[in-house]
């Protein structure tokens, strides 16, 4: 389960430079949820395979309140988050923590419910509606007919809140029915299917930048209205205001 | 089909370090992610070590800083350095390929005991 909520006397230290990792490393305004399948349809080596393809990803990222904002939820018939948008932990932590996803190895992993947690429980509330939302929703099975009645609905209501949701099929038993339906709700959506975890490292660099392309850029800084930069002009030294509409007063 | 041959087991006293070694001869060797198992006489086959094709590991938690796997794709081969041996991995060791799709048959494995 995520972390408590931050108390106000509690370090800060997420912003603290890590340096990056890889060449490529996404610098956007971004929310990303990772979506784990927890059920037996991949053994438990196969499943420590998935957590390192999200580690591999988060190495790419530039995690931070500030930039990519990241939360891990491991599905089965229930949802498990593991990382929470709002954790304030050095990127290097949530790796681990993310590295440390318990296998559940259940019968049945619920597209539907993690979904519905999806949508009613991380995207509840849009706190940064600058950032793009994407959902990297990891599936590697087929839930039970009955439990995939609200499926479409739910799907829907992701993209009327503007998030996008990107399934990866994961080898021979991925529903591929509920993928295609995924791609159909909006042009954003699109899918991988893959043959095997063993092809994920091998996609990684393309899923990752799909979704980096994805976010916007962080606008360039601008100092509040009421900060005043000294500034030398041609033979006259000026103190201009970088408000709007407010004239340069010469010394 | 492809085969695993694993070597390197052994007796060892506690405290005592071993390598085993799984040589295969697949030209998919270098994709694929590979793994080492184990099974102590009377228990299920667990988990012990995963490599992926690119080199990231994860352990169980029982062997998480005593054991270290690698790969050498030159070679299709991969390793499992045992420091610290403890009575409780005595085991027959395996190692295979993670994906289901992609597994040889288990073969004899190489038996590790450790024992003073």
């Known amino acids: 389960p995520t972390d408590a909520p931050v108390s106000p006397t509690t370090l800060y230290v997420e912003d603290i430079s890590e340096p990056p990792l890889h060449d490529f490393y996404c610098s956007r305004l971004l929310d990303l949820v990772f979506l784990l399948d927890g059920s037996s349809r991949l053994s438990e080596a196969e499943f420590e395979v998935l957590k390192a393809f999200v580690v591999d990803m988060m190495e790419r990222l530039r995690i931070s309140q500030k930039w990519v904002r990241v939360a891990v939820v491991e599905y089965h018939d229930g949802s498990h988050a593991y990382i929470g948008l709002k954790d304030r932990k050095r990127p290097s932590e949530l790796r681990r923590i993310a590295s440390q996803v318990k296998y559940a190895g259940s019968q049945v992993a619920s597209t539907s419910e993690v979904l519905k947690y999806t949508l009613f429980q991380i995207f509840s509330k849009i706190d940064r509606p600058e950032a793009s939302r994407i959902t990297l929703l990891l599936m590697a099975s087929q839930e039970p007919q009955r439990m995939s009645r609200n499926f479409v609905r739910y799907v829907q209501g992701l993209k009327k809140k503007k998030v996008i949701v990107i399934p990866v099929g994961i080898g021979p038993h991925a529903n591929l029915k509920q993928i295609r339906l995924i791609e159909k709700q909006a042009p954003e959506n699109k899918a991988f299917v893959l043959s095997s975890v063993d092809e994920l490292e091998q996609q990684r660099d393309e899923i990752v930048s799909y979704l980096c392309d994805l976010a916007p850029e962080a606008p360039p800084p601008t100092l509040p209205p009421d900060m005043a930069q000294v500034t030398v002009g041609p033979g006259l030294l000026g103190v201009s205001t970088l408000g709007p509409k407010r004239n340069s007063m010469v010394l | 089909a492809v085969q695993l041959v694993e070597s390197g087991g052994g007796l060892v006293q506690p405290g005592g370090s071993l390598k085993l070694s799984c040589a295969t001869s697949?030209?998919?060797?270098?994709?694929?992610?590979m793994a080492w198992y184990r099974q102590a006489s009377g228990k299920q086959r667990e988990l012990v070590a995963t490599?992926?094709?690119?080199?990231?590991?994860s352990y169980a938690d029982s062997v998480k800083g005593r054991f270290t796997i690698s790969r050498d794709n030159a070679k299709n081969t991969v390793y499992l350095q045992m420091n610290s041996l403890k009575p409780e991995d005595t085991a027959v060791y395996d190692c295979?390929?993670?994906?289901?799709?992609?597994?040889?048959?288990w073969g004899q494995g190489t038996q590790v005991t450790v024992s003073s």
């Open positions: 697949g030209s998919i060797f270098s994709s694929s992610a």
């Open positions: 490599i992926t094709s690119g080199g990231r590991t």
């Open positions: 295979n390929f993670v994906v289901d799709g992609k597994r040889a048959p």
